[in-house]
Interface confidence: medium
């Protein structure tokens, strides 16, 4: 069937449209196009004879039409009047006619719209605003956007006039936004520039900052006022009802008690004509004197002297406070406060009592702190430590020993070798040592203030050949599943590798085994009874290797759940009952028996001769290991038949 398709159907003014013919019959003589829904010679646009390929314009021809051999018609530079129906009249070679009608619609290209408003400065909670989208255009759809979003649902928003007008009732400050309108028709869509709604509001009740209402004499008073308002508010300050100044901030330097009173901030909006005020009451307190600490002993000796710290000046009806190390006073029998808290006494000072100490005087407003005071506690010297801790050195290296003893004032040091004084220094250095440098190295530390002296002696062996090592342990009887054991291979020697063996084998891989301290220390975590083995440590350097004697770990365990033997539970009357109880335990457990809950003897074996049915019942064996502190038990039922 012959059909006409309009491409496009909706055509913009000035563009073109193609009336495309489908299912054109064969053996044609020619065809004609007419404006309208029927064949009307007065409204012929163009005719076409196929044989001559000749096109003939008709009365309705505008000069903008082009006919194609396939009968399609192109109309260019479309105008509004072109809207409507078009009919194709086909004449076949057998002179039988056929007709088909098509149509299209013409729309204008829309101009960019703009928004007009009936109120450029609406007042919050009072005015309404009507936005209108211009120009008014036929066959156009109107849309609105707020902050580039489609209109929210609100009873205060209303569309009218075919959506061309948007009315906001009772505007609020939140309506301050970007508004746009959009016009659409089938051939175009255009969006307006945004219009910002300027809602007048406020002032709200002003806020005065800072919130602080208490000041001390001599401080600066700096108050700032702010009220939400559009346009921004104008501010005025009143003190005790008297106008001061028209500024947002009020500044009064070096205030006195006389500046106490009520401070009012007034905010005024000239556009809305509204005023709002806020009042704050300021209290100015007199400045108390800054406290300070006096001490009855500036250089106390540790474990000998007491020190009394007093907070000055003495002021009646005042609360005194103390701090040590920026913390409130700890509870300690060595710290005593006087009745009025003004004096803090430290009994038998220690080196940890250095402080700093602060005292404070409390007034209505705040606490005034003294400057911190630090005690110079004389102490020491403690037993000196000689480092490094190596006792074995290989020949040819440098021996560098350092001595340190905790002491105040710092200790003076002396070194002796085999009892002979060497030098009065903290460090002893001997280069390129030989076996002859083996001996007893003594460090002496002296505190000139306390007059005390302490010494430490270290045996140094110079030899490339390593000694036979030994194993020290931090726990000789660890408890299974509870304790850890640390084995240390002695001595500590320079440039030495430490190795370990368990039962003659190298260490197994286990998360419970950990080597540390340069492999010198072997730690067994959460020991088990299976760890009760022979442990050997080895040391090696470039020229020698040596192994310790084995150390067997004595793991305390158990008691495990006991076993009663024999397993029989049925006996004949007159038989002997001989029950033996055993529980795995180290050390061996203590055994006790209960028959039907009644305690019997404390033995591993329970013997009853010539039993009768009276001996029926429950037989319980209890085991306890005093070393592990653990207990266990088992119950067995015995039946004696007559």
């Amino acid at each position: 069937k012959l059909t006409i398709e309009s491409t496009p159907f909706n055509v913009a003014e000035g563009k073109e449209v193609l009336l495309l013919v489908h299912n054109l019959p064969q053996h044609l003589f020619g065809y004609s196009w007419y404006k309208g829904e029927r064949v009307d010679g007065n409204r012929q646009i163009i005719g076409y004879v196929i044989g001559t390929q000749q096109a003939t314009p008709g009365p309705a021809y505008s000069g903008r039409e082009i006919i194609y051999p396939n009968a399609s018609l192109l109309i260019q530079n479309i105008i509004q009047n072109d809207t409507g129906f078009y009919t194709l009249h086909v004449i076949k070679s057998d002179l039988v006619n056929e007709e088909a009608t098509g149509q299209f619609r013409v729309y204008p290209e829309l101009p960019k719209p703009s928004i007009s408003s009936n109120n450029s400065k609406p007042v919050e909670d009072k005015d309404a605003v009507a936005f209108t989208c211009e120009p008014e255009t036929q066959d156009a759809t109107y849309l609105w956007w707020v902050n580039n979003q489609s209109l929210p649902v609100s009873p205060r928003l209303q569309l009218s006039n075919g959506n061309r007008t948007l009315t906001l009732f009772n505007v609020t400050r939140n309506d301050t936004a970007s508004y746009k309108c959009e016009t659409q028709n089938p051939v175009s869509a255009r969006r307006s520039d945004s219009v910002i709604l300027n809602v007048l509001y406020g002032p709200d009740a002003p806020t005065i900052s800072p919130l602080n209402t208490s000041y001390r004499s001599g401080e600066n008073l700096n108050l700032s006022c702010h009220a939400a308002s559009n346009p921004p508010a104008q501010y005025s300050w009143f003190v005790n009802g008297t106008f001061q100044q028209s500024t947002q901030e009020l500044f009064i330097p070096n205030i006195t008690v006389n500046n106490s009173g009520s401070y009012t901030c007034q905010a005024h909006n000239s556009d809305t004509g509204l005023n709002r005020t806020t009042v704050t009451t300021i209290t100015v307190y007199a400045e108390p004197p800054k406290p300070f600490i006096t001490s009855n002993n500036s250089n106390p000796v540790e474990d000998e002297d007491a020190v009394a710290l007093t907070c000055e000046p003495e002021i009646q009806n005042t609360t005194y406070l103390w701090w040590v190390n920026n913390q409130s006073l700890p509870v300690s029998p060595r710290l005593q406060l006087s009745n009025d808290n003004r004096t803090l006494t430290l009994l038998s000072v220690t080196r940890n009592d250095v402080g700093p100490y602060e005292c404070g005087i409390q007034n209505e407003l705040s606490v005034d702190h003294s400057d911190p005071v630090i005690l110079n506690v004389l102490y020491g010297p403690d037993d000196p430590t000689i480092s490094p801790s190596y006792t074995y050195y290989r020949p040819g290296v440098n021996l560098s020993l350092s001595c340190h003893a905790a002491s105040n004032p710092p200790a003076q040091y002396s070194w002796l070798i085999d009892g002979n004084i060497q030098q009065h220094t903290q460090e002893l250095f001997i280069s390129n040592i030989t076996e002859k440098n083996s001996g007893l190295y003594t460090c002496q530390a002296n505190n000139s203030a306390s007059g005390h002296s302490r010494t430490t002696v270290k045996t140094i062996t110079v030899s490339a050949e390593l000694p036979k090592p030994s194993i020290s342990s931090n726990n000789s009887k660890p408890v299974e599943d509870k304790d850890a054991v640390a084995f240390t291979c002695e001595p500590e020697a320079q440039n030495t590798t430490y190795l370990w063996w368990v039962n003659g084998q190298s260490l197994p891989v286990s998360p419970r085994l950990q080597l540390s301290n340069g492999n010198r220390t072997l730690t067994l975590f959460n020991v088990t009874r299976n760890d009760a083995r022979a442990y050997v440590c080895g040391i090696q350097n470039s020229v020698s290797a040596n192994r310790s004697d084995p150390v067997t770990l004595d793991v305390l365990y158990g008691p495990d759940t006991p076993i009663i033997s024999p397993p029989d539970s049925s006996y004949l009357s007159g038989a002997n009952l001989n029950l033996s109880c055993h529980s795995a335990s180290n050390p061996s457990p203590q055994y006790s028996w209960r028959i039907n809950g009644i305690p019997q003897q404390h033995t591993q074996v329970l013997f009853i001769a010539k039993i009768t049915p009276n001996n029926n019942g429950t037989y319980a064996c209890f085991v306890s290991n005093l070393a592990t502190g653990r207990n266990n038990s088992i119950v067995k039922s015995i039946t004696v038949s007559a």
Epitope: R394, P395, G396, T434, E435, S463, A464, E465, P467, G538, Q540, S542, V543, S544, A545, N546
Partner: antibody, heavy 120, light 106 residues
């Protein structure tokens, strides 16, 4: 099993230098110290020194300071002894000797020796 | 350096005979080590740290001593024991060997 394979015999002119090698198998030389010992014709054993292949630390007998230089190549598990300013006195068999108790004892493992002959 | 003096320089022994070789140090040492060397072969450790038998060494070998005086003893000489024996100290650098004692089979 632990083995030390030394390079072949060397004939060197007086004043010249030579580099001997010792390749280990059965262990990683980084876990050991490598000692070098020499033995002159019809003479006793003389300790030259050692090298720690892990960090390159060395110890030389005073007599061989400046004469012997130890190096290692851990990628090929090989230790080297370089001898310089050779004289007829340096004619000897040179042994490498592994100084860590794989055995479990020290000095259990020796190379087969490299004969160095210094000719004038 | 610590000089080690071995004696005798040469010793002959019949199979089954007891042999003792001594080693004297110019400075005291904590331990002495002994090596055996047969012609054309590398030295082999026989005793370490004065008295410990090295791996694979027959029990007829033993060692003793302290300070500056040490000895190696073969309780019953066997033909395979014929070799040169060297003592070694490892207490001080340089490590030193004795001049050697040649043990021959009678």
């Amino acid at each position: 099993q632990v083995q030390l394979q030394q390079s072949g015999a060397e004939l060197v002119k007086s004043g010249g230098s030579v580099k001997l090698s010792c390749t280990a198998s059965g262990f990683n030389i980084k876990d050991s110290y490598m000692h070098w010992v020499r033995q002159g014709p019809e003479q006793g054993l003389e300790w030259i020194g050692w090298i720690d292949p892990e960090n390159g630390d060395t110890e030389y007998a005073p007599k061989f300071q400046g004469k012997a230089t130890f190096t290692t190549d851990t990628s090929s598990n090989t230790a080297y002894l370089q001898l310089s300013s050779l004289t007829s006195e340096d004619t000897a068999v040179y042994y490498c000797n592994e100084g860590t108790p794989h055995g479990p004892y020290y000095f259990d493992y020796w190379g087969q020796g490299t004969t160095v002959t210094v000719s004038s | 350096e610590n000089v080690l003096t071995q004696s005798p320089a040469i010793v002959s022994a019949s199979p089954g005979e007891k042999v003792t070789i001594t080693c004297s140090a110019s400075s005291s040492v904590s331990a002495m080590h002994w090596f055996q060397q047969k012609p054309g072969t590398s030295p082999k450790l026989v005793i370490y740290s004065t008295s410990n038998l090295a791996s694979g060494v027959p029990a007829r070998f033993s060692g003793s001593g302290s300070g500056t005086s040490y000895s190696l003893t073969i309780s019953r000489m066997e033909a395979e024991d014929a070799a040169t024996y060297y003592c070694q100290q490892r207490d001080s650098y340089p490590l030193t060997f004795g001049a050697g004692t040649k043990l021959e089979l009678k």
